[in-house]
Amino acid sequence: EGYCGPCPNNWICHRNNCYQFFNEEKTWNQSQASCLSQNSSLLKIYSKEEQDFLKLVKSYHWMGLVQIPANGSWQWEDGSSLSYNQLTLVEIPKGSCAVYGSSFKAYTEDCANLNTYICMKRAV
Amino acid sequence: EGYCGPCPNNWICHRNNCYQFFNEEKTWNQSQASCLSQNSSLLKIYSKEEQDFLKLVKSYHWMGLVQIPANGSWQWEDGSSLSYNQLTLVEIPKGSCAVYGSSFKAYTEDCANLNTYICMKRAV
């Protein structure tokens, strides 16, 4: 047994990473700003195995994945590239941002759309 | 900020309570036994507000709610009665056990059915 964290009060802690699900619907930029104001960033999937509980998260929430206009590739907020083994990206509508939608699937969306969002704080 | 727990390794910690989602499908009795073997019990909803993250959990998982044959009432594993403000119980098929199905809804099921399950360890 052991302690998890540290995390902001009432956040979820898993493998020393902190997560919070926010009900307010915001644009991607607003969601990013909200996470930053809480010393965190939008959700990043770095390992299906280590973040396995996320496969059961229902509905659609902004995550920290954006498309680079120059070459159309997708990258995380921290600048790292999206890897095929992190999640499946379903590109249907035109959009440069993405929502997380359970079972490690993400869906492209217009960044101006309003959605709930997930903030995350990686373990140091 | 603060630490959460203590919890078994790799469990989810929220408000000092510990949760784990198990992928193996078992009967209700087998699920209960699995949780007990890990010094925990099947999921109990005691407060929508304090367990708000559970509203986003998709799929259907055994929880610690059973029907008392004598009077048809529903109670938790710890013997306390189900309260209307804890969750909404949808009585679909005949069954004396219940699965948790997101948004604080539970669905009755035959206890011999196979389902995934959620174990929980209350904060001391």
């Epitope: 659609y60 990206l89 939608g101 079972s103 699937k105 869906y107 309003l114 | 997101s102 948004s103």
Partner: antibody, heavy 117, light 107 residues
Framework: QVQLQQWGAGLLKPSETLSLTCAVY????????WSWIRQPPGKGLEWIGE???????NYNPSLKSRVTISVDTSKNQFSLKLSSVTAADTAVYYC???????????WGQGTLVTVSS | ELQMTQSPSSLSASVGDRVTITCRTS??????LNWYQQKPGQPPKLLIY???TRESGVPDRFSGSGSGTDFTLTISSLQPEDSATYYC?????????FGQGTKLEIK
């Protein structure tokens, strides 16, 4: 161009198990959920459930205790089994690609399943 | 489960008319609302997703609007081939649910 083709028994007796299969041709199989939806004669549409390539399933709680959806990734096929059928299960059953938030498209041609003694 | 209320259940209109069908949900679903057209003996066809985005190949006389709990499908100038039943569907929450349908007839 993704196309779905479905088949299975069209006439069942009460208490039997309905069994349908849907094959996916073209496009990505792994990137989506694959759904079953039914429509009783002259009535509306009811979502039954869905599965993805990894076997992850979501079911309608009203049918969950009788439904099994499975997948065969080697053939790009997914199947529906509905046990203990009654006359109330008489419907046209459709398979469809579930595009997450963006609706169901395309659809299979539909299979009329009649339950009668 | 999330309830979908569609109105009217049926309507009759003339070629060239502007037709509006509404869909109301029992709770907010953001813009995760899709519209389908179904003709007799055929599977439904996706017309609109994300409340207002036309599916590829759908004529621009079809448009969708709304967010939250109230949504509208509009056919700006009715054509004979638009005679069909129209369904709304929410993709916000499982189980996915459909409206009861609106049967549109051409006078």
């Amino acid at each position: 161009q993704v196309q779905l083709q479905q088949w299975g028994a069209g006439l069942l007796k009460p208490s039997e198990t309905l069994s349908l299969t849907c094959a996916v041709y073209g496009g990505s199989f792994s990137g989506y959920y694959w759904s079953w939806i039914r429509q009783p004669p002259g009535k509306g549409l009811e979502w039954i459930g869905e599965i993805d390539h990894s076997g992850s399933t979501n079911y309608n709680p009203s049918l969950k205790s009788r439904v099994t959806i499975s997948v065969d990734t080697s053939k790009n096929q997914f199947s529906l089994k509905l046990s203990s059928v009654t006359a109330a299960d008489t419907a046209v059953y459709y398979c469809a690609r579930a595009r997450g938030p963006w609706g169901f498209d395309p659809w299979g041609q539909g299979t009329l399943v009649t339950v009668s003694s | 489960e999330l309830q979908m209320t569609q109105s009217p259940s049926s309507l009759s209109a003339s070629v060239g008319d502007r037709v509006t069908i509404t869909c109301r949900t029992s709770q907010s679903i953001s813009s995760y609302l899709n519209w389908y057209q179904q003709k007799p003996g055929q599977p439904p066809k996706l017309l609109i997703y994300w409340a207002s985005t036309r599916e590829s190949g759908v004529p621009d006389r079809f448009s969708g609007s709304g967010s939250g709990t109230d949504f509208t499908l509009t056919i700006s100038s009715l054509q004979p081939e638009d005679s069909a039943t129209y369904y709304c569907q929410q993709s916000y929450d499982i189980p996915y649910t459909f409206g009861q349908g609106t049967k549109l007839e051409i006078k």
